[in-house]
């Protein structure tokens, strides 16, 4: 006799208004009496509709939450599994049931903002900027909302960057406990003459940090050939261990680059009689603290003004 189990009931994908953080939920299947004592596990697969691969999780719960790109639709499917302990070793699963979440197609794509860029300056404040849609009426204006886990609900930007009295960006500070988790943004718009398509963005703040440039550069030469360069980590909340540095050294007309995770570097002069010895440095958050980052601006150049003769110190 073939053992069968029913799929979960009432599978649906819900939007609680958190700008892309969706709830996938379902109810337990109708279970026949002989399996009442068995543990049910649910295999859930989901993806944005343009994705090649499904994300798969197994849960004993009746809800799962995750972040999605709301610029595209979402589809999911779920089935019930019975433990082999309950089925004499055979793998028993229900048929799949499916659900989808369609994005709003209100407003043409040409009305959606363009070139959304966000930078988390010195791990202290976030600046996002955008350009208006390609074809929008002159009364169109945009509004930015954001959410991350820890906020009760999505919040609107309170400090807009403006151009010609239109919102073209937003500055956010005091983002407590907002890094190392998905940060969701929606920029929607309004016009009396046409609907405006919303734009959604998701990233993690630590991956878009642009630090301040290093400061207090110092260069010295020992034994007339050993160059020692040092600098200070910029002020602010980024721990010193999180920086990586790129250094450009200039000796007369020759320049070369080097890299380090420390805030000093030693190397040999290329020519004893060189008259000009300078360096400058920039920094970025390293791979131990983020998956990505943005290089700081270059520091001011620092030059060694010492005497180039053989007895110089």
């Amino acid at each position: 006799l073939e053992i069968k189990v029913n799929p979960p009931q009432d599978f649906e994908i819900l939007d609680p208004g958190l700008l892309g953080y969706l709830y996938l939920q379902w109810k337990p299947p109708v279970v026949i009496e002989k399996f009442k004592g068995c543990t049910l596990e649910y295999e859930l697969k989901y993806r944005n509709v343009d994705s090649d691969s499904w994300k798969t999780i197994i849960t004993r719960n009746l809800i799962y939450k995750d972040g999605f790109d709301l610029n595209k639709g979402i589809e999911g499917k779920i089935r019930t599994h019975l433990s082999e302990h309950c089925t004499n070793g055979s793998e028993v699963q229900s048929p799949w049931i499916e659900a989808s979440y369609g994005i709003s197609d209100e407003g043409s794509l040409e009305t959606k903002i363009q070139d959304m860029k966000c930078i988390y300056y010195n791990w202290q404040y976030l600046v996002c900027s955008w350009k208006p849609g390609k074809t929008v009426y002159s009364d169109t204006n945009y509004t930015m909302f954001f959410w991350y886990e820890g906020l009760d609900h999505a919040l609107q930007c309170a400090d807009y960057l403006q151009h010609d009295e239109k919102n073209v960006g937003c500055k956010l500070s005091n983002l407590d406990s907002s890094d190392y988790k998905d940060f969701f943004i929606c920029v929607n718009g309004s016009s009396k003459l046409e609907p405006i398509r919303s734009s959604y963005t998701v990233f993690q703040l630590q991956n878009i940090v642009k630090p301040l440039p290093p400061e207090f550069l110092h260069i010295s030469v020992e034994n007339s050939i050993d160059i020692r360069m040092k600098w200070s980590t910029p002020g602010g909340p980024i721990p010193p261990r999180c920086y990586t540095y790129e250094i450009v050294i200039r000796e007369d007309d020759i320049s070369w680059e080097s890299a380090t995770d420390k805030n000093d570097m030693k190397l040999k002069r290329r020519a004893n009689e060189s008259e000009d010895l300078c360096f400058f440095v920039r920094c970025k958050v390293n791979i131990y603290c983020a998956d990505d980052g943005i290089w700081s601006e270059w520091s001011e150049e620092e030059c060694w003004e010492g005497y180039t003769g053989p007895d110089s110190k």
Partner: antibody
Framework: EVQLLESGGGLVQPGGSLRLSCAAS????????MSWVRQAPGKGLEWVSA????????YYADSVKGRFTISRDNSKNTLYLQMNSLRAEDTAVYYC??????WGAGAFDYWGQGTLVTVSS | DIQMTQSPSTLSASVGDRVTITCRAS??????LAWYQQKPGKAPKLLIY???SLESGVPSRFSGSGSGTEFTLTISSLQPDDFATYYC??????????FGQGTKVEIK
């Protein structure tokens, strides 16, 4: 008496490969799901991978996905972990563990004694 | 991923003491939680499964309670053999299966 016996650990260079085995006895091997769990020196427990009783479904931690492959041979009562592109951070004692009940995972009621994998140049 | 946070990280106690270790899940995991004991150089040993069910052969001085996000392991009267590191583990939703960072119970 339930027994799980790991083997195959050792010293390997970064980028190298190893295959761990876990020989099981004392229970009907094809029934429970099985997992590999590792413990870096002086650190806590980290789940690595799981496989259902039939071997039909496998699951991995993000840190090993695409590099490690879990498999089982129910006719030989043996669980395997093929580890490729090994990194220094994979250095750990690797335990195989039996799921008490559950299709893919659960509480682990029996553990092997562990096999040490050291990734170093 | 579901994060599991144990407290305290280290606990100093004496034989005969009542000891409580807490484990907090970052989201509800119903009662799908296990507790393990591990001694240096040894494999972990299952003590409690499904939050409160005592594994066969485990002394009754060990008990587990809680559901949702807050769980506790209690040792009613600490014995010399109980000085070890204890881990909680969720198996509600995976991958990944996640463990707490461990609580070391040491002699005061």
């Amino acid at each position: 008496e339930v027994q799980l016996l790991e083997s195959g650990g050792g010293l390997v260079q970064p980028g190298g490969s190893l295959r761990l085995s876990c020989a099981a006895s004392g229970f009907t091997f094809k029934l429970p799901a099985m997992s590999w769990v590792r413990q870096a020196p002086g650190k806590g427990l980290e789940w690595v991978s799981a496989i259902t009783g039939s071997g039909g479904s496998t699951y991995y931690a993000d840190s090993v996905k695409g590099r490690f492959t879990i498999s089982r041979d129910n006719s030989k009562n043996t669980l395997y972990l093929q580890m490729n592109s090994l990194r220094a951070e994979d250095t750990a004692v690797y335990y195989c563990a039996k799921v008490r009940y559950g299709w893919g995972a659960g509480a682990f009621d029996y553990w092997g004694q562990g096999t040490l994998v050291t990734v170093s140049s | 991923d579901i994060q599991m946070t144990q407290s305290p990280s280290t606990l100093s106690a004496s034989v005969g003491d009542r000891v409580t270790i807490t484990c907090r899940a970052s989201q509800s995991i119903s009662s799908w939680l296990a507790w393990y004991q591990q001694k240096p150089g040894k494999a972990p040993k299952l003590l409690i499964y499904d939050a409160s069910s005592l594994e066969s052969g485990v002394p009754s001085r060990f008990s587990g309670s809680g559901s949702g996000t807050e769980f506790t392991l209690t040792i009613s009267s600490l014995q010399p053999d109980d000085f070890a590191t204890y881990y909680c583990q969720q198996y509600d939703t995976y991958p990944p299966i996640t463990f707490g960072q461990g609580t070391k119970v040491e002699i005061k």
